[in-house]
């Protein structure tokens, strides 16, 4: 990680992708520590952009503007050398977001995938972006970059992610950029949560008073397991959104969540999954599907008194 003997390592915290108006800490790690250092921005010339200022440990840059986007290097203090400074560090690209309209991000075949599968994340826009960038929340590495393919007034790029394992689960966003300002990125796409299933044992799903109910009768679906899941996720076939509830320890040592569906008006096939707070985007195997049938006079939909989660937010903790 530290590079060569006389080469410092420049890194950015929390990320190299910074929103306009945000702040980023640049750290120059040299010779097993954070010494005094100088920063350079590579604007065609290797001149200190910060007027020869010397920094200690880290430099907090911001509020950032589009002009801050670009490639940075540092030199560590080396008092007994000829120049007094080390060789230049690795290049570090800082990308500033919020400069163009946001693109859209889709998952094919979908955002809920089994461990080992591959997912295509397609970033697209009717803004003619030259490059698309894909970034996973909480990751400090550079985003993946692809050239946009333009057809019928739409620019798009397909990012292949896989084979999926827990480390790849999480919240993804994509950005676009135009040629003359490759590191001045667009506003972020709406977040897309990629969830990996099949990592833990399946919970069981049951219905109270039972899987066959009269129209208008209140129905509750209970998801439970001996595994100490923190959260249960309930999905209905054909519905984009899942509901989630905190698991509650029961006297019989199971962990359970009860999803009240309200007065039954419409049947459907339900599944539930368990997950742990530490890895909110890594889910258990699916429960066996539970078919809920409504006898009587079914209407077109089932009201949901519990607010379903949005298409994103799955990978955030429940507070």
């Amino acid at each position: 990680l530290m590079g060569g003997q006389d080469k410092p390592f420049l890194s950015a915290r929390p990320s190299t992708v910074v929103p306009r108006g945000g702040h980023v800490a640049l750290q120059c790690h040299y010779r097993r520590g954070f010494n005094n250092f100088m920063l350079y921005k590579e604007d065609r010339s290797h001149v200190p952009i910060f007027h020869g200022r010397i920094f200690q440990e880290s430099f907090i840059m911001g509020p950032v503007t589009p002009a801050h986007a670009g490639t940075y290097r540092c030199r560590g203090s080396r008092p007994h050398s000829l120049t007094g400074w080390s060789a230049p560090s690795n290049p570090l690209v800082i990308m500033v977001t919020g400069n163009h309209r946001k693109p859209s991000l889709l998952a094919h075949p979908g955002p809920l995938l089994k461990s080992g599968e591959t997912v295509i994340l397609q970033c697209w826009s009717d803004v003619m972006f030259e490059h698309f960038f894909l970034h996973r929340e909480g990751i400090s590495e550079d985003p993946s970059r692809l050239v946009g393919q333009i057809h019928d007034g739409v620019s798009k790029a397909n990012f292949s992610i896989g084979p999926l394992m827990p480390v790849l689960a999480g919240t993804y966003r994509c950005y676009g950029s135009v040629p003359h300002s490759p590191y001045q990125l667009s506003a972020p796409s709406d977040p897309l949560d990629i969830v990996i299933t099949g990592l833990y044992e399946k919970p069981s799903l049951s219905a109270q008073p039972g899987p066959t109910v009269q129209a208008g009768e209140n129905v509750t679906l209970s998801c439970s397991s001996w595994s100490s899941y923190d959260i249960y996720h309930l999905s209905r076939e054909g519905e984009a959104h899942e509901r989630r509830l905190r698991a509650v320890p029961k006297v019989n040592r199971t962990f359970q969540a009860d999803f009240p569906l309200g007065p039954a008006t419409h049947g459907g096939t339900y599944r539930c999954f368990g997950s742990f707070r530490a890895l909110p985007c890594v889910w258990s195997n699916s429960s066996d599907p539970l078919l809920v049938s409504v006898t009587g006079n079914p209407s077109s939909s089932w009201p949901s008194p519990t607010e379903p989660s949005s298409k994103s937010g799955i990978c955030r903790h429940l507070h």
Epitope: H100, R101, V127, M128, E130, V178, P179, H180
Partner: antibody, heavy 112, light 107 residues
Framework: QLVQSGPELKNPGETVKISCKAS????????MNWVKQAPGKGLKWMGW????????TYADDFKGRFAFSLETSASTAYLQINNLKNEDTATYFC????????WGQGTLVTVS | DIKMTQSPSSMYASLGERVTITCKAS??????LSWFQQKPGKSPKTLIY???RLVDGVPSRFSGSGSGQDYSLTISSLDYEDMGIYYC?????????FGGGTKLEIE
């Protein structure tokens, strides 16, 4: 398409403001470029304005007396030239997108 | 600034002839090059972007090629309506810069 305002005849020292009205696409999708063409001469890029953020960028020769602005609600970009000089006599074009995909018909400004 | 050197500055060609115009950049422009055609008293018309991509509606006799610093526009079979002035533009780096233009006339 991009439709520009009509020709202007001005005296030296005056100000001119040219408009460029966009239609048929989402205005904030594409930056708006401005290009100067003096009579019998080639094309010269003046700069661009980011229609999403409103930030203008000027080429060195067009810093100072030149100003790009937007009226996003009307899908219109403007070029204003202050303190006009004889050498500003030219046709001014607006063109949108990173590779100047579509152009306005041009506005002839005569300073005399 | 990146300098775009276009050649020839003017040329005569016959109908049906194959015509090539070249543009040389003072540094690598990563294929971020457009070609335009301008007729007298009209605004420029975009023919090609990203060095090789034909804009919708532009006749297929036009083609672009090149990479790095050297680029060319070819008209495979010259048509009467192709006369005009042709410009290249680099959009890799600000400020954008145009070539000086090539005046194409029919002989």
């Amino acid at each position: 398409q991009l439709v520009q305002s009509g020709p202007e005849l001005k005296n030296p020292g005056e100000t001119v403001k040219i408009s460029c009205k966009a239609s048929g696409y989402t205005f904030t999708n594409y930056g708006m470029n401005w290009v100067k063409q003096a009579p019998g001469k080639g094309l010269k890029w003046m700069g661009w304005i980011n229609t999403y953020t409103g930030e203008p960028t000027y080429a060195d020769d067009f810093k100072g007396r030149f100003a790009f602005s937007l009226e996003t609600s009307a899908s219109t970009a403007y070029l204003q030239i202050n303190n006009l000089k004889n050498e500003d006599t030219a046709t001014y074009f607006c063109a949108h997108g990173p590779w100047l995909a579509y152009w306005g018909q041009g506005t002839l400004v005569t300073v005399s | 600034d990146i300098k775009m050197t276009q050649s020839p500055s003017s040329m005569y060609a016959s109908l049906g002839e194959r015509v090539t115009i070249t543009c040389k950049a003072s540094q690598d422009i990563n294929v971020y090059l457009s070609w335009f055609q301008q007729k007298p008293g009209k605004s420029p018309k975009t023919l090609i972007y990203r060095a090789i991509r034909l804009v919708d509606g532009v006749p297929s006799r036009f083609s672009g090629s090149g990479s790095g610093q050297d680029y060319s526009l070819t008209i495979s079979s010259l048509d009467y309506e192709d006369m005009g002035i042709y410009y290249c533009l680099q959009y890799d780096e600000l400020p954008y810069t145009f070539g000086g233009g090539t005046k194409l006339e029919i002989e």
